[in-house]
């Protein structure tokens, strides 16, 4: 029925999304400017909207010619399919006066058997199938071609490839008479990149490989595939990067043991176990060396396959990531928090940081939170004074005519920045939390007297009295 | 026009048996995942059973489990549910749903079928 | 299982004022950008009718004065101005997961 959200089927299926690239439309300029700069010192965010606003002032009327949307592709390799068998794609906005080139992969979950991909067709079918996926996507975000929204990137050509194979990017199996359905989310991304090479992809100077939640840890699982396939096609110069953000998981123990029946239940170790064998899923060579037959399931958590990696890897991950408390069967419901929880995501967070310490270009902030990168409100968070965008370009700038991250961080341009403040939302640039049961916004002194912290306890180390701490805490300072 | 039509019901013996059924039409039903929703006289809505879309898994309540079975053809556009074991808590409007695949939740309502446990 | 906890029970509405019921989750029904909880209507001797999907999306043919919102675990129904024919039973009911459940129901009445 009408009124629904534009990816849901309309009754009537609409005609194939176009397999080819559409011809400049009359009357549009087919030469663009492009205004590529790697790095700018100063205040970036102003500086950007001025060459912004000049840029599009030497096209008349150019304010009807600025289309956010990027456009659908479906795959012109049909056999490369989504889970029910329907073609793979991806979204573009090129632009073409750019040698940057980022390319996004989508999360949602997984399923790991035939039940809970069952179910998972049956309410959530466009993360299984590009059958009702809309014509066009709007970039948000670090895919915004917005410099007040993107301030890091918003000039590069942008690529959204949607999540369809619900196996963490991994798969390479095909849909049979024996599988039900198909997990080819690795071959998916090899095949996007085959395809835009078509489209100017191969002019290319960087590629960022960047992903949420599952597109995050497939950012992990596929960046150095993506540069080997690029070296064999004849590409060696094209530098391949990546960007995880909430894919740095934990093998952890659950704070409450539970049985692996659903997605959301399962720990972490059992559901990527069951999972690997049932997508027949594909992790990075190297690091497959490193562990026997069988326990290649290692590979999907972070800490473990990016000592492996060759490409540089920007790691963004809240400390207490949401969804890594789901999978640890913690659900912060109304009630305060017993000691035990409370001590059980204290812990949780110090172990996350831990794995990050040799990880020298990484982000990671005090909150409880889950994604980032494509929010339109990215670029206010901080940590230690410096913004995501900001530590992206210094990354940028870190790695400026090498593949490797140089050892001595450039002064004043951080890359290394991870929240060492103890407790959830302790940083004040978190994004704002709502109690969970009234949906009413609470500030940080509300919300971490609701985890259960006494404020004697926390303001101790700090060298405060607890009503200094609170009357801090409430200003945002 | 999208239509769900349940029968079957009627009065029953403890410990009886009887099969419901529900037949659709004016949509592809091999497309959408099935559910039985039941309503005891003056209650509130209870979720009973799930088929996929394909057939292929079933899932129910922990109040059913055991004494129910859920299936379909799809070949005939009808859902099944068969049940053995009757109590009188069972007795219930028993209504068929359709589940949109794009969030699960129930677009399409039968008018329901009334089943009786009694002695 | 996710419960749902559906507030008040009943509630009396004068005509053209607002009504608001509210459901609680027993954890988070949202994922990937969309929260899986959806509102029904059901009258005497009917089957429930949907009023809005995905916490939020009015369903074709559903006047406007319905409204849904909320996220993780609290989600609350809308009826502003109240009229007559709302006079019904409201129930909440997600599908993030199986088994799937509804909340107990609330009963309006406009005075």
């Known amino acids: 029925s009408e009124g629904r959200k534009t990816w849901r089927r309309r009754g009537q299926q609409p005609p194939p999304p176009p397999r080819t690239e559409a011809a400049p439309a009359a009357g549009q300029p087919v030469e663009s400017f492009p205004l590529d700069f790697t790095a700018v010192e100063g205040n970036m965010d102003s500086f950007m909207a001025q060459v912004k606003s000049l840029a599009q002032s030497l096209y008349p009327c150019s304010a009807q010619q600025l289309n956010e949307d990027l456009r659908l592709h479906l795959l012109l390799n049909t056999s490369v399919t989504c889970n029910d068998g329907s073609p793979a794609g991806y979204y573009l906005k090129e632009s073409r006066g750019s040698r940057r080139w980022l390319l996004f992969l989508e999360g949602g979950w997984y399923c790991f058997n035939r039940e809970n991909c069952d179910s998972r067709y049956d309410t959530m079918r466009r993360l299984m199938s590009s059958r009702d996926w809309p014509r066009t996507r709007t970039g948000t975000g670090i895919l915004s071609s917005q410099p007040e929204e993107n301030p890091y990137w918003w000039n590069a050509n942008m690529v959204f490839i949607p999540y369809c194979s619900s196996d963490v990017w991994s798969g390479a199996s095909p849909k049979s008479d024996k599988n039900e359905y198909a997990f080819m989310g690795s071959l998916i991304i090899q095949e996007v990149v085959r395809e835009l090479l078509g489209k100017g992809l191969s002019g290319a100077k960087v590629l960022l490989l960047a992903g949420s939640s599952a597109g995050g840890t497939g950012v992990l699982l596929n960046v150095d595939r993506v540069a080997e396939l690029l070296e064999e096609l004849g590409y060696p110069s094209i530098q391949v990067r990546g960007l995880a953000d909430s894919g740095w998981f934990l093998d952890n123990k659950q704070y409450r043991r539970s049985d692996c029946i659903d997605t959301i239940n399962c720990a972490p170790t059992d559901a990527i176990r069951r999972g690997i064998r049932y997508w027949s899923g594909m992790v990075p060579e190297r690091c497959q060396r490193q562990f026997k037959e069988g326990e290649e399931w290692n590979c999907f958590f972070g800490y473990k396959v990016y000592p492996t990696l060759r490409c540089p890897v920007f790691v963004v991950q809240w400390l207490f990531d949401e969804a890594q408390l789901t999978v640890d069967n913690v659900h912060l419901t109304g009630q305060p928090v017993q000691e035990g929880l409370r001590l059980y995501i204290q812990n949780l967070g110090r172990e996350l940081r831990h794995t990050l310490k040799d990880v020298p270009a990484s982000f990671a902030p005090a909150c409880l939170s889950h994604e980032i990168i494509i929010r339109s409100h990215w670029t206010d968070v901080q940590v230690k004074g410096t913004s995501l965008p900001r530590a992206l370009h210094c990354w940028d700038r870190s790695l400026h005519d090498s593949h490797k991250a140089s050892k001595t961080p450039l002064k004043g341009c951080p890359v290394h920045l991870v929240d060492s403040c103890p407790w959830p939302h302790c940083n004040p640039s978190c994004p704002t939390v709502r109690d969970q049961f009234t949906g009413q916004e609470m500030n940080v002194a509300q919300f971490l007297m609701h985890m259960g912290f006494d404020m004697q306890t926390v303001a101790q180390p700090q060298g405060l009295e607890p009503s200094e701490l609170l009357g801090m805490l409430s200003n945002g300072s | 026009d999208v239509q769900l039509l349940e029968s079957g019901g009627g009065l029953v013996q403890p410990g009886g048996s009887r099969k419901l059924s529900c037949a659709a039409s004016g949509f592809t039903f091999s497309d959408f995942g099935m559910h039985w929703v039941r309503q005891a006289p003056e209650k509130g809505l209870e979720w009973v059973a799930y088929s996929s879309s394909g057939g292929t898994t079933v899932y129910y309540a922990d109040t059913v489990k055991g004494r129910l079975t859920l299936s379909r053809d799809n070949s005939k556009n009808t859902l099944f549910l068969e049940m053995t074991s009757l109590r009188s808590e069972d007795t219930a409007m028993y209504y068929c749903?359709?589940?949109?695949?794009?969030?699960?939740?129930?677009?399409?309502w039968g008018q329901g079928t009334s089943l009786t446990v009694s002695s | 299982d996710i419960v749902l906890t559906q507030s008040p029970a009943s509630l009396a509405v004068s005509l053209g004022q607002r009504a608001t019921i509210s459901c609680r989750a027993s954890?988070?029904?949202?994922?990937?950008?969309?929260?899986?909880i959806h509102w029904y209507q059901q009258k005497p001797g009917q089957p429930p009718k949907l009023l809005i999907y995905?916490?939020?999306d009015l369903e074709s043919g559903v006047p406007a004065r319905f409204s849904g919102s909320g996220s993780g675990a609290a989600f609350t129904l809308n009826i502003h101005p109240v009229e007559e024919e709302d006079a019904a039973t409201y129930y909440c009911h997600h599908s993030r997961e199986l088994p799937f459940t509804f909340g107990s129901g609330t009963k309006l009445e406009i005075k």
């Open positions: 954890k988070s029904v949202s994922t990937s950008g969309y929260s899986y």
């Open positions: 995905l916490a939020s």
């Open positions: 749903a359709r589940a949109s695949y794009d969030g699960g939740y129930f677009d399409c």
